[in-house]
């Protein structure tokens, strides 16, 4: 897996006006990382993990840049000439990488009401569109609008490319990336249901990457998924995941339940607590 | 209909510089996409060498980078490549072509580097 | 920089037989920046297959391109007398462009 930095930013119009503020996170490897809110920017760190590590230095200077490129989103949006009465969002995520032979990629998308009409390649400056004649045509309109943009500004889009991948290299350095696996701590619970049954619960948490197998397992069977609940993998704000699975069963049958689970190679089982 | 032509002298000394232009007529280079520049070794594989953009950026092969430079004449619709302090091995024949996957190519020239 | 890798070095098959050629990256590439050509003696490369899928204008359709991530495909469904030559691949994702080193396609 490369190490990634990927900045999303939206940007909305309603009856042909475009609003002010925008929205913007960052991810780093994945794992949420910074978040502006939409009036006021202001980076904020995603958690404890990524504030022990970073000054605000980072946050000052993030905040600097986002403000800006959400300025210039904004501009863009205004530049789009088919907009229709309702709300309209212009979306644009830039991605830069760092894989393990020390080669890069760095490439930005533009979304208009979540439909992807516009890529770039930063590194080589190609563009790439879909082949619909709706994309086509706001393709063509906002690349004239940034090609003329950019002549005026003289910034081009490796700068971009080299931007982020500066800013990656940076937070590689700073150790602000986890390692790449943090297995999981399993907590099992069990709650009165109704009479002669009991809900037991298993918790997995603080784990990376999110991909985890959780389940309910009687005499060493799994259980059928339609005899267990799960919650949905979320991001607990330190950048890690957290996750649920619960199933009901007979009091006094509780020691032949155990919750499995498989992360990143490695399996445990956890009985119920009597 | 989009073309391509390389022009240059076909035989350079060693330790000289290495000089073409290629011309493109059907489309302007300030529209879009790189303009490169390829070469092929005698019975060898291609290389790439590097490009200049539609934008005006220059992208080159750090295999060569402290020698070469891209340059371009838009009024001329040109672009031009310089290779300083040649020696035996940039014996080849020399592309332009356009793209990043490169749909047009000029038929190439022949450069020879001996004294 | 990123190494392509074509195999066979050279295929030897008779005309109306399949041809497949394989083209592997020491890194993931993506497969809109991945590209064939054919090249025959004495002329400039031809663009053959973009965006790994796509056949280049004036193509026939037994070429057919396919792949992802490292791993990259040419095929020629039925060898004619004129599809023997020197096929390249080539990626565009990250600077330096590169090359395969080629497969030389000859008659058996």
């Known amino acids: 897996e490369p190490h990634s930095l990927r900045y999303n930013l939206t940007v909305l119009s309603w009856d042909g006006s475009v609003q002010s503020g925008f929205l913007a996170e960052v991810h780093l490897d994945g794992q949420p990382f910074l978040r502006c809110d939409r009036q006021k920017c202001r980076a904020k760190p995603q958690g404890q993990w990524a504030e022990d590590v970073l000054g605000n230095k980072t946050w000052d200077r993030e905040t600097r840049d986002l403000t800006g490129n959400g300025k210039d989103l904004r501009m863009t949006l205004a530049h789009i000439k088919d907009q229709k009465e309702g709300l309209h969002s212009l979306q644009e995520i830039r991605v830069c990488e760092i894989h393990e032979d020390n080669s890069t990629r760095s490439s930005q998308h533009f979304y208009y009401d979540g439909e992807l009409f516009l890529s770039q390649n930063l590194e080589t400056e190609e563009w790439t569109m879909p082949q619909s004649s709706r994309a086509q045509t706001l393709a063509m309109n906002v690349r004239n609008f940034l090609k003329e943009d950019a002549m005026k500004t003289k910034t081009h889009y490796h700068a971009m490319h080299a931007d982020c991948l500066q800013e990656l290299r940076r937070y590689l350095k700073s150790g602000v990336v986890l390692r790449r696996t943090v297995p999981p701590m399993v907590n099992v619970t069990r709650s009165e249901a109704s009479e002669g049954n009991i809900t037991v619960t298993c918790r997995a948490s603080g784990f990376y990457p999110w991909n985890i197998t959780l389940s309910w397992r009687q005499d060493g069977v799994s259980l059928s998924h339609d005899t267990q609940q799960w919650g949905d993998v979320l991001p607990d704000g330190n950048g890690t995941y957290q996750t649920w699975v619960a199933t009901r069963i007979c009091q006094g049958e509780e020691q032949r339940f155990t919750c499995y689970m498989e992360h990143s190679g490695n399996h445990s089982t956890h009985p119920v607590p009597s | 209909q989009v073309q391509l032509q390389e022009s240059g002298p076909g035989l350079v000394k060693p330790s000289e510089t290495l000089s073409l232009t290629c011309t493109v007529s059907?489309?302007?280079?300030?529209?879009?996409?790189?303009w490169n520049w390829i070469r092929q070794p005698p019975g060898k594989g291609l290389e790439w060498m590097g490009f200049?953009?539609?934008?005006?950026?220059?992208k080159y092969n750090p295999s060569l980078k402290s020698r070469i430079t891209i340059s371009r004449d838009t009024s001329e619709n040109q672009f031009s490549l310089k290779l300083s302090s040649v020696t035996a091995a940039d014996t080849a024949v020399y592309y332009c072509?356009?793209?990043?996957?490169?749909?047009?190519w000029g038929q190439g020239t022949t450069v020879t580097v001996s004294s | 920089e990123i190494v392509l890798t074509q195999s066979p070095a050279t295929l030897s098959l008779s005309p109306g037989e399949r041809a497949t050629l394989s083209c592997s990256a020491t890194?993931?590439?993506?497969?809109?920046?991945f590209h064939w050509y054919q090249q025959k003696p004495g002329q400039a490369p031809r663009l053959l297959i973009y965006?790994?899928?796509n056949l280049a204008s004036g193509i026939p359709a037994r070429f057919s391109g396919s792949g992802s991530g490292t791993s990259y495909t040419l095929t020629i469904s039925s060898l004619e007398p004129e599809d023997f030559a020197v096929y390249y691949c080539?990626?565009?994702?990250?600077?330096?462009?590169?090359f395969g080193q080629g497969t030389k396609l000859e008659i058996k």
């Open positions: 059907g489309y302007s280079i300030t529209s879009d996409y790189a």
């Open positions: 080539q990626q565009g994702t990250t600077i330096p462009f590169t």
């Open positions: 965006r790994t899928s």
């Open positions: 072509a356009r793209g990043y996957g490169f749909d047009y």
């Open positions: 200049v953009s539609y934008s005006g950026t220059t």
């Open positions: 890194s993931s590439i993506s497969s809109i920046y």
